[in-house]
Interface confidence: low
Amino acid sequence: GELETSDVVTVVLGQDAKLPCFYRGDPDEQVGQVAWARVDPNEGIRELALLHSKYGLHVNPAYEDRVEQPPPPRDPLDGSVLLRNAVQADEGEYECRVSTFPAGSFQARMRLRVLVPPLPSLNPGPPLEEGQGLTLAASCTAEGSPAPSVTWDTEVKGTQSSRSFTHPRSAAVTSEFHLVPSRSMNGQPLTCVVSHPGLLQDRRITHTLQVAFLAEASVRGLEDQNLWQVGREGATLKCLSEGQPPPKYNWTRLDGPLPSGVRVKGDTLGFPPLTTEHSGVYVCHVSNELSSRDSQVTVEVLDPEDPGKQVDLVSASHHHHHH
């Protein structure tokens, strides 16, 4: 006769582990008992349970309520047992010893592998700012047994590096994703992908990149000179910029306070019916937490009664102040 068993039994944490031990013998052979033991390199061999032909299943009190026979129907030659709710401490080597009559004793050893699925966590790096060099965008850590695989899925150009810490019964893997921040990355997804034999499918955690930047400011509204004539209504100057975080806008007049009736509404400067008093240099101030930028334009309101006067559109000048 011989024992049919497995070299390795793999089970996910919390599941029931079936430890197989089936005696394949001649029809006239009988199994007297099947003894299950835990083989520990430090503690030696520790009885787990005993399947006795006469006494049935008896479990070592230390494993009470955790060891059972598989549900019926059962073959009298099947000495397999179920280890309920496998925990990491159950991982290791097990032995079944089958006492048969008249063939004698047979024994087999197997390894129980308890997979501990990882629960990944993603930690964003320091705030990203356009103009920085290679910077940590995010790190992703996953601990499990065996060691999980941690990779990144993204369209963003960057570099990834991993390091591993081994604990007595598990391993923690941390992967970092570094990049050179640019405004094109803003809003792009950066996904940490964790693979592990204990997972039915990869675990994914997505982080949306936020890169702080502030674009050059420019002013629109002076393109049509005919709008800037005395008496005209609805004239506006609009300050154009973009940034992350979204910028705030402010308007001032370089050569004095804003004329009466001129209204600031966010990025737009609204004029009342135009008079020559509205001529002057206007400055748009754009700022966010990262920096600030200025753009100035010269407005000259044309008086149709005075043909010598023309609307003068001065090229905008730009200034940039980093916070």
Epitope: G32, L50, H52, Y55, H58, P61
Partner: antibody, heavy 119, light 107 residues
Framework: EVQLVESGGGLVQPGGSLRLSCAAS????????MSWIRQAPGKGLEWVSG????????GYADSVKGRFTISRDNSKNTLYLQMNSLRAEDTAVYYC????????????WGQGTLVTVSS | DIQMTQSPSSLSASVGDRVTITCQAS??????LNWYQQKPGKVPKLLIY???TLQSGVPSRFSGSGSGTDFTLTISSLQPEDFATYYC?????????FGGGTKVEIK
């Protein structure tokens, strides 16, 4: 048929030594947990010591710890009890018994061997 | 160590009587309790194991019950061959321990 036969008993002086043997037959000795149990004249049963199939797990009653040593030789199907520093209170019939494990009942017993400690 | 306390230590009964012997463990031993019968000059014989399971060949008038710390051996109708000493034994942990015994005598 399962048989357990003890031998080695006899009269010994206090402080003396004896070695008991238990020869097993009719079952796979090497798979079974073996125990020594004693019974003083007119008294109850007292478990003395036990040893697992591979000698990996050994236990003793407090009353004999440090004086008695249990061992087995699976190749000879024999269980032993080395008794040193014997005292008058060790006088008893010594039985060997087998069980599937220490947490199973003692289902087969030998006929016993009498140890008398007296000056 | 687990102490096993058996009571009574002796009792007198007549053939046909119902006899009950109790055994108390000093801590919870689940159902790891066995009962043995010993006749004078004879080897102990296993009657009941796992608190309530009858050993093969043992008459059905013997029964066992209990779990945890309190256990009972009952002989429903005492027969002449049942006059003997009865011992309980815990197999929950080593050292294995026996009760002091209950001697059942003829009234």
């Amino acid at each position: 048929e399962v048989q357990l036969v003890e031998s080695g008993g006899g009269l010994v002086q206090p402080g003396g030594s004896l070695r008991l043997s238990c020869a097993a037959s009719g079952f796979t000795f090497s798979d079974y947990y073996m125990s020594w149990i004693r019974q003083a004249p007119g008294k109850g049963l007292e478990w003395v010591s036990g040893i697992s199939w591979n000698s990996g797990s050994i236990g003793y009653a407090d009353s004999v710890k440090g004086r008695f040593t249990i061992s087995r030789d699976n190749s000879k199907n024999t269980l032993y009890l080395q008794m040193n520093s014997l005292r008058a209170e060790d006088t008893a019939v010594y039985y060997c018994a087998s069980s599937g494990s220490w947490y199973l009942p003692l289902d087969y017993w030998g006929q016993g061997t009498l140890v008398t400690v007296s000056s | 160590d687990i102490q096993m306390t058996q009571s009574p230590s002796s009792l007198s009964a007549s053939v046909g009587d119902r006899v009950t012997i109790t055994c108390q463990a000093s801590q919870d031993i689940s159902n790891y309790l066995n009962w043995y019968q010993q006749k004078p000059g004879k080897v102990p014989k296993l009657l009941i194991y796992a608190a309530s399971t009858l050993q093969s060949g043992v008459p059905s008038r013997f029964s066992g019950s209990g779990s945890g710390t309190d256990f009972t051996l009952t002989i429903s109708s005492l027969q002449p061959e049942d006059f003997a000493t009865y011992y309980c034994q815990q197999s929950y942990s080593t050292p294995l321990t026996f009760g002091g015994g209950t001697k059942v005598e003829i009234k």
